[in-house]
Interface confidence: low
């Protein structure tokens, strides 16, 4: 099960500080909520489970008391607090519960925690640059590709999708991997549209936790004229 | 001690084929369950199938389990692979307590599955250059096979990034390589593919206008973002 928006949640914290992670389970047993940590290259492991009937936390062996705390009474408002963070606490944290109808464990959509000792710029939201289709592509292929470059953001968790103006339909786009550049990240996404859509305005919509005011950033790609130029392909 | 081992860190397989993911486990329990989960790029963890230690081989749609209790092996086969099956797959052993709601899962490290397009006719790419300020993007469209070298040709490089190579909706490949150059106006792109070289200049058009399609109105095309 996953949260409704399908949004990858992320939290960035400095070493030594605390973080709060919320649970977003849609179904399953409310009585016992389990917390798992998955770090890249390792097996996911349970940290603890919370018994809501007795409001008690049962820690896995090797987990130091005081590191984690949980509160809340249902799967919708259950939260876990992580204290005295170190870089090795970075990873994806899942809450989970057993399905009441069928013996299987259901996981929340996961929250990525990034713990860093670096002092980041005050603004680590994605900085956009737009690329419009080349004339060669529009004339030779009767299609055009828009490219949306996003730079200097942190942490690396980002979602990009494309829409036409005045439409909520998500268009089929493609994207590169998120790449590390110094202490921040960059990513780009591109959208190829047929000639008939080139005269429409397109939007590259970017979801990132450090966007201004916490809202999706919309990068506008203007409609383009393809009829003003007559062309003669060199070699095609 | 309970332990789960997924020895394959990653596997690749073409669409429509089947892939088998191996999982070995150690347990002192006699009765238990093994679970398979799929982790999407978004990190969402989705339950796929469950195998009981006292049950016949489990099957659910395109997922089937080959369970060998004596060998402590529980292999997952995904048949008729689709591009959307590309993900990381985890095998997990359920620790049975007296009270199932507190049971723990012991996971393996996971196997990354990459589903590739089918073998198909070799297709030469189209190559186009897109520019904005010092930024240059080389767009390489609809090629097969995947192996490709993309070079942005410039004498004044600031920085370059590794290309992104992705499966196109038509099942071929698309790629984009980005770079920053002081002389962006003179940058061209050359591509080595299938022992041939393709240049962006091969696709250029004779025109008395600028290098790029014009916006309908005079708009700032650098960073017209709104929050």
């Amino acid at each position: 099960s996953s949260n409704l928006e399908g949004r990858t949640k992320s939290v960035i914290r400095q070493t030594g500080s605390s973080a709060e992670i919320t649970c977003d389970l849609a179904e399953g047993s409310t009585g016992y909520i389990h917390w798992y940590l998955h770090q890249e290259g390792k097996a996911p492991q349970r940290l603890l489970y919370y018994d809501s009937y007795t409001s008690s936390v049962v820690l896995e062996s090797g987990i130091s008391p005081g590191k984690y705390d949980t509160y809340g009474s249902t799967r919708k408002n259950l939260r876990m607090i992580l204290r005295n963070l170190i870089e090795n606490d970075s990873g994806v944290y899942y809450c989970a519960t057993w399905d009441e109808k069928y013996y299987k464990k259901l996981f929340g959509s996961g929250t990525t925690l990034v713990v860093t000792d670096k002092q980041l710029d005050a603004d680590v939201s994605p900085k956009p640059t737009i690329f419009l289709p080349s004339i060669a592509e529009t004339k030779l292929q009767k299609a055009g590709t828009y490219l949306c470059l996003l730079e200097k953001f942190f942490p690396d968790v980002i979602k990009i999708h494309w829409q036409e103006k005045k439409s909520n339909t998500i268009l089929g786009s493609q994207e590169g991997n998120t790449m590390k550049t110094n202490d921040t990240y960059m990513k780009f996404s591109w959208l190829t549209v047929p000639e008939k859509s080139l005269d429409k305005e397109h939007r590259c919509i970017v979801r990132h936790e450090n966007n201004k005011n916490g809202v999706d950033q919309e990068i506008i790609f203007p409609p383009i004229k393809t009829d003003v130029i007559t062309m003669d392909p060199k070699d095609n | 001690a309970q332990k789960v081992t997924q020895a394959q860190s990653s596997v690749s397989m073409p669409v429509r084929k089947a892939v088998t993911l191996n999982c070995l486990y150690e347990t002192s329990w006699w009765s238990y369950y093994i679970f398979w989960y799929k982790q999407l790029p978004s990190k969402e963890m989705i339950f796929l199938i469950r195998q009981g230690s006292d049950e016949q081989n489990a099957k659910s749609g395109r997922y089937s389990v080959n369970f060998k209790k004596a060998a402590k092996s529980v292999a997952l086969t995904i048949s008729a692979l689709q591009l959307e099956d590309s993900a990381k797959y985890f095998c997990a052993l359920g620790e049975p307590n007296h009270f199932l709601n507190t049971d723990k899962l012991i996971f393996g490290k996971g196997t990354r599955v990459t589903v590739e397009p089918r073998s198909q006719p070799h297709t030469k790419p189209s190559v186009f250059v897109m520019k904005n300020g010092t930024n240059v993007a080389c767009l390489v469209k609809e090629f097969y096979p995947k192996d490709i070298r993309i070079n942005l040709v410039s004498s004044k490089k600031i920085t370059e990034f590794d290309p992104a190579i992705v499966i196109s909706p038509s099942g071929k490949y698309n790629a984009v390589k980005l770079g920053k150059y002081e002389d962006s106006n003179s940058v061209t792109c050359s591509v080595q593919h299938d022992n041939k070289t393709v240049h962006s200049t091969d696709f250029e058009v004779k025109t008395d206008s600028t290098d790029h399609v014009k916006p309908k109105e005079t708009e700032n095309t650098k960073q017209p973002s709104k929050s």
Partner: antibody, heavy 130, light 107 residues
Framework: EVQLVESGGGLVQPGGSLRLSCAAS????????IHWVRQAPGKGLEWVAS????????YYADSVKGRFTISADTSKNTAYLQMNSLRAEDTAVYYC???????????????????????WGQGTLVTVSS | DIQMTQSPSSLSASVGDRVTITCRAS??????VAWYQQKPGKAPKLLIY???SLYSGVPSRFSGSRSGTDFTLTISSLQPEDFATYYC?????????FGQGTKVEIK
Amino acid sequence: EVQLVESGGGLVQPGGSLRLSCAASGFTVSSSSIHWVRQAPGKGLEWVASIYSSSGYTYYADSVKGRFTISADTSKNTAYLQMNSLRAEDTAVYYCARPYYWYPYYYWSGGWEYAAFDYWGQGTLVTVSS
Amino acid sequence: DIQMTQSPSSLSASVGDRVTITCRASQSVSSAVAWYQQKPGKAPKLLIYSASSLYSGVPSRFSGSRSGTDFTLTISSLQPEDFATYYCQQYGEYPITFGQGTKVEIK
């Protein structure tokens, strides 16, 4: 200009054989796929077989599997349909067709090789009768 | 195999009428559906591909749409040259399959 021209049809007795040809021009069969579709008199369209000549992949309808063989000679830019053990129900106009490779805006199982048919030949009539 | 159930099998209409033909796939075929027009003694002609994309050169009065496994071909204003038989086709999975056809006749 893209063109497909079928030939080789005719009257044949049940159990007999026939080889249909599909000569392509305006494109290379090695860079595309070729498909055979038939239409029995007064009936609808029925897909028969497909070939991807560069990879060698072939596909057949259950009704012809084991009796028909699709092939291509890239040097002649021609595709063939070898039809053996012919039956009365194989009587039809046989068309060869080429797929339309435009950028499709969707994903689906199997990926690249699927496309609608934009160019068709004029058809060749095969009559199986004693 | 994916069955394509096309309806109606025939219809009578007048010039200027709006005509709708539907095809239901027995299982998901994504948008890998095409529509063809065929006239007697001629090869089929591609009208619509990818469920809703108009093939080049086809008049804009033809349109296609998809809702789940239901696919629709609409002719917004029937013209004299549109009287023909129409077929849907799924090409998302082998074997490729066609609908049974819809004959559009003059009322």
